[in-house]
């Protein structure tokens, strides 16, 4: 009985051609969506001449199809029981999914601008800036359409500067013929409790973007754990999208196309500040911006990102302190919505369903040389768009899993 | 190759003024900065000013603000310096050196020129 | 103006000996961003300085690799580990996180 069954799910679960999850690691079976809301800002010259509230209206969804790509140079090593693969990035606009097209224009802070202010910081430099800012006629914020925000155009103040800097900004500029990896997962051949963990990315154990460890690369990329998931475990996954590893711990069991699935959350403490959770220090990585490490909800990976000032959160600023969200109008967080959740199919460790949750925010500061941000009298952290990713399984692949799988179980 | 260019010696009377020059060749030169750097054996190394060819942007030590004016002429690829009101004080070796516009070190030297001031 | 303050003001060493300068800020020079403008600049008799190390511990082109610098914060240290008769000069420390830019005061690298 249970025995047997162990035996076939530990067979089945290995990353190797020929088994059930080598077939579905490869290239998902699951259709996987990007959807994206956008905060349009309603109020630009007010905040940029009198530092107001910045009062945004969240406009979306805007869907793509993602994650439709197999796995490339999918490689097994037989010494160290682990295969690699790079896992390639691709989006296509599904318009039927979403509220406007990808021309749709929007108010949204300058991200060169901001970027460029924090990455200089030399007052001489930051007059060079300011004179090519103005002679570009950019400002603190610029209108752009939905596909040059995310994917990519060529900012005409960066188009001025001398060199280094490339002159192409977008928030997930490059993406399409880009792949993420290299990865190096464990195959679960010589120890199954180990399977689809990450050994390396980019060839490190380590990120190089944190202290101490918080700059471990821990468990799985999230797409599936390792057989026979107890209620009581963390699951610890690592997210390219956020620089980091994190974990989830379990909700509550839920009914997934009669599947029995544990769903698994990421706690409002993941998100805590260090005088709430300790083990958060070492991801405070300034104490200006941090308030001394008291502020909490938003994640500085700048480090990570170039230097640009990029603060990753969840949306609407869900579980951040007052602090943060206090000088934005028109925020409205709620767990339903704005949480990120994985449901775990327990006895295969494969996630049959997931809500993949996140807000891209860029940091300003008033600079007393760049014209522009002149007037600022304080820090935004500013809302730029939130995302939900999610997969659910098919009915087809529901079906096949209920009668191979929990079928037998039960 | 990168080179900075300048006059060897320039010899001057109290109360008057000089221009010199610093001539830059082998780059781009509205994609630098130029900065001037005094020597004297008293004083060491001292920042004076930098300026921004591409679009003449300037920034000096509150030391030598109504001292020194930089200038450049991207036609002729060339900076200059103008120190006015000339005291023995400003007898010194004059150093143009350049950096890149978004960079604070300087990987470029002219050889220097020397000013004495004296009746 | 941050005030850079280097040891020793004169340094006798033997040829193949290890040298050590160092250099010590008033105040922070790590910019918020998290660069550190610390260089380190070599001036030979009668010529014009000529740079060594940028950004700290960064090693100019065509600097030997017997040149190391390392510190942070306030702190930094130029070590030269064999040291040969072309070392010879006066050694700088600077400063160009902070406008203005200031320079230590300069170590006399001699034979003992």
């Known amino acids: 009985g249970d025995l047997l069954i162990q035996k076939t799910i530990k067979k089945q679960v290995v990353l190797e051609e020929g088994t059930i999850a080598f077939k579905n690691w490869v290239k998902t079976g699951t259709e996987v969506y990007r959807q994206f809301w956008i905060f349009d800002v309603q109020n630009p010259q007010e905040v940029m001449m009198n530092s107001s509230n910045i009062q945004v209206k969240q406009r979306g969804p805007y869907t793509y199809r993602v994650r439709f790509l197999a796995k490339e140079n999918v490689t097994q090593d037989a010494e160290d029981n682990t295969v690699s693969f790079l896992q390639p990035n691709g989006a296509i606009f599904e318009p039927s999914l979403s509220v406007g097209t990808e021309a749709d224009n929007f108010t949204v802070l300058n991200l060169a601008v901001a970027a460029a202010s924090h990455i200089y910081q030399n007052q001489f430099v930051q007059m060079i800036l300011n004179s090519l800012i103005n002679k570009s006629k950019s400002s603190m914020f610029q209108v752009r359409t939905l596909r040059e925000l995310l994917w990519g155009y060529r900012d005409p103040f960066l188009s001025l500067v001398p060199y280094p800097v490339t002159t192409t900004v977008g928030l997930f500029y490059p993406y399409n013929n880009t792949a993420d990896g290299v990865y190096k997962v464990f195959n679960g051949k010589d120890n199954i409790s180990k399977v689809a963990i990450i050994d390396t990315y980019k060839g490190k154990r380590n990120l190089s973007y944190w202290e101490s460890h918080c700059d471990m690369i821990n468990g799985t990329d999230a797409a599936s754990f390792p057989p026979f998931v107890e209620k009581s475990q963390v699951l610890q996954f690592f997210s390219s999208d956020i620089c980091r590893s994190i974990y989830a711990v379990f909700e509550s069991d839920v009914n997934l196309k009669g599947i029995p699935v544990y769903r698994f959350v990421l706690p409002s403490k993941a998100f805590a500040s260090p005088v709430e959770n300790p083990d958060n220090y070492c991801f405070c990585t300034e104490k200006i911006i941090s308030k001394n490490c008291t502020s909490y909800g938003v994640l500085d990976i700048s480090k990570c990102k170039e230097g640009r000032p990029v603060y990753i959160s969840l949306p609407h600023f869900l579980y951040a302190s007052p602090d943060v969200s206090e000088p934005i109008d028109g925020l409205n967080p709620n767990e339903e919505e704005h949480r990120t959740y994985l449901d775990i199919e327990p006895i295969t460790g494969f996630t049959l369903q997931f809500a993949k949750r996140l807000q891209v925010n860029l940091l300003v500061k008033p600079s007393e040389k760049i014209q522009v941000l002149k007037n600022l009298k304080r820090n935004y952290i500013v809302p730029i768009l939130w995302l939900n990713e999610t997969g659910t399984i098919g009915d087809e692949k529901a079906n096949m899993f209920r009668s191979q799988v929990t079928g037998k179980i039960n | 190759q990168v080179q900075l260019q300048q006059p060897g010696a320039e010899l001057v009377k109290p109360g008057a003024s000089v221009r010199m020059s610093c001539k830059a060749s082998?780059?781009?030169?509205?994609?630098?900065?130029m900065h001037w750097v005094k020597q004297t054996p008293g004083q060491g190394l001292e920042w004076i000013g930098v300026?921004?060819?591409?679009?003449?942007?300037?920034s000096y030590s509150q030391k030598f603000k109504g001292k020194a004016t930089l200038t450049a002429d991207k036609s002729s690829r060339t900076g200059y310096m103008q120190l006015s009101s000339l005291t023995s004080e400003d007898s010194a070796v004059y150093y143009c050196?350049?950096?890149?516009?978004?960079?604070?070190?300087?990987?470029?030297w002219g050889a220097g020129t020397s000013v004495t001031v004296s009746s | 103006d941050v005030l850079m303050t280097q040891t020793p003001l004169s340094l006798p060493v033997s040829l193949g000996d290890q040298a050590s300068i160092s250099c010590r800020s008033s105040?922070?020079?790590?910019?918020?961003?998290?660069?550190?403008?610390l260089e380190w600049y070599q001036q030979k008799t009668g010529q014009s300085p000529k740079l060594l190390i940028y950004?700290?511990?960064n090693r100019f082109s065509g600097v030997p690799d017997r040149f190391s610098g390392s510190g942070s914060g306030t702190d930094f240290t130029l070590k030269i580990s064999r040291v040969e008769a072309e070392d010879l000069g006066v050694y700088y420390c600077?400063?160009?996180?902070?406008?203005?830019?200031?320079f230590g005061g300069g170590t006399k690298l001699e034979i003992k």
């Open positions: 050196t350049r950096s890149g516009w978004d960079d604070w070190f300087f990987d470029v």
């Open positions: 082998g780059y781009t030169f509205t994609n630098y900065n």
């Open positions: 300026i921004y060819p591409g679009n003449g942007d300037t």
């Open positions: 105040q922070s020079i790590v910019q918020r961003n998290g660069i550190t403008y």
């Open positions: 950004k700290v511990s």
């Open positions: 600077f400063q160009g996180s902070h406008v203005p830019p200031t």
